[in-house]
Interface confidence: medium
């Protein structure tokens, strides 16, 4: 891990690209601009990464430390049940939903929330560090 810290965005962590944060053996990108879900997905894929898929509660709570009240798209969609972008099931957390048309997932510092996929939000990309 970089300079003894759990996570870092510093220049002394060459294993992640500029503007990406390293944690463990992964790199994370927190966007500033906003896009709809599919455009966010395509942004991540074009950068050799994927929309954030969270492995467990530990990773989720760590990432939430970096988030504000603003929601960020993650690689979660309701496709006959809530599943991550790769098709694996969401099984360690619940997701809050107000409507059946809210079929894409977003995260903020407090929770996972369903949203309409056409809404423009910030997003988080994730990839394995080199």
């Amino acid at each position: 891990l970089c300079q003894g810290s759990k996570y870092s965005t510093c220049a002394s962590c060459p294993s992640c690209p500029d503007h990406w944060m390293k944690y463990g053996n992964h790199c994370y990108y927190f966007s500033v601009e906003k896009k709809d879900w599919i455009s966010s997905l395509e942004f991540c894929l074009a950068r050799d990464s994927h929309l954030l898929m969270i492995t467990d509660k530990q990773e989720m709570s760590l990432l939430q430390d970096f988030l504000s009240e603003a929601f960020h798209w993650v690689g979660l969609r309701n496709n006959s049940g809530w599943r991550w972008e790769d098709g694996s099931p969401l099984n360690f957390s619940r997701i809050y939903s107000n409507s059946l048309v809210q079929t894409c997932g977003a995260i903020n510092k407090n929770s996972l929330q369903a949203s309409s996929c056409e809404v423009s939000l910030q997003w988080v990309c994730k990839k394995v560090s080199p």
């Epitope: 053996n25 395509e42 894929l45 994927h50 492995t55 006959s80 098709g87 694996s88 099984n91």
Partner: antibody, heavy 116, light 108 residues
Framework: QVQLKQSGPGLVQPSQSLSITCTVS????????VHWVRQSPGKGLEWLGV???????DYNAAFISRLSIRKDNSKSQVFFKMNSLQTNDTAIYYC??????????WGQGTSVTVSS | QIVLTQSPTIMSASLGERVTMTCTAS???????LHWYQQKPGSSPKLWIY???NLASGVPARFSGSGSGTSYSLTISSMEAEDAATYYC?????????FGAGTKLELK
């Protein structure tokens, strides 16, 4: 470089089970899911199931009652087992790595004939 | 289940000829999750085009892909001998994952 190497029997008796091991290198099973697909002259390419990086599994509903996929991350091995094989299960069985958004590397295939 | 129908089943082309094959889905598929694989006899399928139009590593630039919704296609701008193979479309959009029956491309 990324490799998936399969080992398993070529001939299986009807009603017996098929076991195939997929040993991977060049990537970790803790960060990539592994899918299983078979190919037969009659049915083409058929998706059978997947074991996700976190260890959970999903199966094609048509095979769920007789299919089991498990893995050993430390040995970089994925284990495929299908029970109660019949002659129409004769096919080439493949393991394939998932690297979003697609299965990008496939094993060499295990040719399985079900016959007495 | 999403059924993928490929056409034609078999086709032949001369060297230098432009080739187009199609893949039609029974229901809409996200272009991000529509892929093409190339397979030659005795070999495993190789990822050839991913997310509708992106060439996999090492794939010649004469290949291209396009489409959206339920209609997708793979095009070779100028046929070469090494392109003779079977091409399968595949959807990673919805479980169970499915593949087309393939288009076998032969050299005329």
């Amino acid at each position: 470089q990324v490799q998936l190497k399969q080992s398993g029997p070529g001939l299986v008796q009807p009603s017996q089970s098929l076991s195939i091991t997929c040993t991977v290198s060049g990537f970790s099973l803790t960060t990539h899911g592994v899918h299983w697909v078979r190919q037969s002259p009659g049915k083409g390419l058929e998706w059978l199931g997947v074991i996700w990086s976190g260890g959970s599994t999903d199966y094609n509903a048509a095979f769920i009652s007789r299919l089991s996929i498990r893995k050993d991350n430390s040995k970089s091995q994925v284990f495929f087992k299908m029970n109660s094989l019949q002659t129409n299960d004769t096919a080439i069985y493949y393991c394939a790595r998932l690297r979003l958004p697609a299965m990008d590397y496939w094993g060499q295939g295990t040719s399985v004939t079900v016959s007495s | 289940q999403i059924v993928l129908t490929q056409s034609p089943t078999i086709m032949s082309a001369s060297l230098g000829e432009r080739v187009t094959m199609t893949c039609t889905a029974s229901s809409s598929v996200s272009s991000t999750y529509l892929h093409w694989y190339q397979q030659k006899p005795g070999s495993s399928p190789k990822l050839w085009i991913y997310s509708t139009s992106n060439l996999a590593s090492g794939v010649p630039a004469r290949f291209s892909g396009s489409g959206s919704g339920t209609s997708y296609s793979l095009t070779i701008s100028s046929m070469e001998a090494e392109d003779a193979a079977t091409y399968y479309c595949h959807q990673y959009h919805r479980s169970p994952l499915s593949f087309g029956a393939g288009t076998k491309l032969e050299l005329k």
